[in-house]
């Protein structure tokens, strides 16, 4: 059994998140993940989900009663989602930490916008992809 | 020429983001995008970058002087990144809007954590992927 399972069960107890009422009003993530089978679509969604959990864990990192559980789960997320690649994890972390209200960051972001946009669609990379996109819109 | 180019140039003027000093201290996004060639890795990073721009645009949506530019760029992002797929865009938006400080959201997130984790690595989906992962770690 992966290390995160026991620690996630601990967090469930901490948050009283095992109660049946928690499932009221649908799911946060699981329903959305069900919608997307294509790996690159899943990564788009999982990227947001993982950053949500990292933010959540950051808010609870000082609570000594669950510190070990939080650390273990974060470590296991690094293994699973970033394939234990520290550079990938660091780049991701950098992106999540940029402040959207900082004028210097805003100026840089706008300065880079055209080039970022040019790279957004897989079509930008190869002609083959462009053709398949036109066949399968959506 | 894509519609976004002219409007991005407008935003550059608005933010004085054409000045040479903007490039000081490296890039926000472009350097990171250069690091990742594999499509699924790029999507992990681009997901964060796109959510950053959407947050930025939200902060400026009431500024009539750049409203049209912002709307045009957002629309073009939808076309490029979400392949004009409204469902994909809506799911993405949902994920970016969850409040990490809301206790009910926290409880739901922890309730779903084990299942989310189980789906994080592509290896979880097929044996073939698992094999290729072991050949190409990183």
């Amino acid at each position: 059994q992966d290390p995160y399972v026991k620690e996630a069960e601990n967090l469930k107890k901490y948050f009283n998140a095992g109660h049946s009422d928690v499932a009221d009003n649908g799911t946060l993530f699981l329903g959305i993940l069900k919608n997307w089978k294509e790996e690159s679509d899943r990564k788009i969604m999982q990227s947001q989900i993982v950053s949500f959990y990292f933010k959540l864990f950051k808010n609870f990192k000082d609570d000594q009663s669950i510190q070990k559980s939080v650390e273990t789960i974060k470590e296991d997320m690094n293994v699973k989602f970033f394939n234990s690649n520290k550079k990938k994890r660091d780049d991701f972390e950098k992106l999540t930490n940029y402040s959207v209200t900082d004028l210097n960051v805003q100026r840089k972001a706008i300065h880079e916008l055209i080039q970022v946009m040019a790279e957004l669609s897989p079509a930008a990379k190869t002609g083959k992809r462009k053709r398949s996109q036109m066949l399968f819109r959506g | 020429q894509d519609p976004y180019v002219k409007e991005a140039e407008n935003l550059k003027k608005y933010f004085n983001a054409g000045h040479s000093d903007v490039a000081d201290n490296g890039t926000l996004f472009l350097g990171i995008l250069k690091n990742w060639k594999e499509e699924s890795d790029r999507k992990i990073m681009q997901s964060q970058i796109v959510s950053f721009y959407f947050k930025l645009f939200k902060n400026f949506k009431d500024d009539q002087s750049i409203q049209k530019s912002v709307e045009t760029i957002k629309e073009d992002m939808n076309v490029k990144f979400f392949n004009s797929n409204k469902k994909k865009r809506d799911d993405f938006e949902k994920l970016t809007n969850y409040s990490v400080t809301d206790l009910n959201v926290q409880r739901k997130a922890i309730h779903e954590l084990i299942q989310v984790m189980a789906e994080l690595s592509p290896a979880a989906k097929t044996g073939k992927r698992k094999r290729s992962q072991m050949l190409f770690r990183g």
Epitope: F15, N16, D62, D63, Q64 | L103
Partner: nanobody, 120 residues
Framework: QVQLVESGGGLVQAGGSLRLSCAAS????????MGWFRRAPGEEREFVAF????????YYADSVEGRFTITRDNAKNTVYLRMDSLKPEDTAVYYC?????????????WGQGTQVTVSS
């Protein structure tokens, strides 16, 4: 500021019971999350149990769940830890702690500790 003073420790045989008390002064603890931690010789401090401000929501370390019970009496400004079926590995200094938030945030206020020794 909150001052915490633990009492009730001592020497007990394996299988026996003890009740630790933690008396708070300086402020009423009714809005605090109250917890117990322990440090065994040569080990890091580990979490044992806490009770949230509502008095009904509790959380225990796996190692003590089912054997230890944490309760609070806000009128007496006191928190208790009932320890049953004690094992030699429960031997440690037990510390009472208080956190200002029910969820997240650190335990910022600590007592001096009370020694519990379980002999086999």
């Amino acid at each position: 500021q909150v001052q915490l003073v633990e009492s009730g420790g001592g020497l007990v045989q394996a299988g026996g019971s003890l009740r630790l008390s933690c008396a708070a002064s300086g402020r009423t603890i009714s809005s605090f999350r109250m917890g117990w931690f322990r440090r065994a010789p040569g080990e890091e401090r580990e979490f044992v149990a806490f009770v949230r401000s509502n008095g009904t929501s509790t959380y225990y370390a796996d190692s003590v769940e089912g054997r230890f019970t944490i309760t609070r009496d806000n009128a007496k400004n006191t928190v208790y830890l009932r320890m049953d079926s004690l094992k030699p590995e429960d031997t440690a200094v037990y510390y009472c702690a208080a956190a200002t938030r029910d969820y997240g945030g650190s335990f910022d206020y600590w007592g001096q500790g009370t020694q519990v020794t379980v002999s086999s």
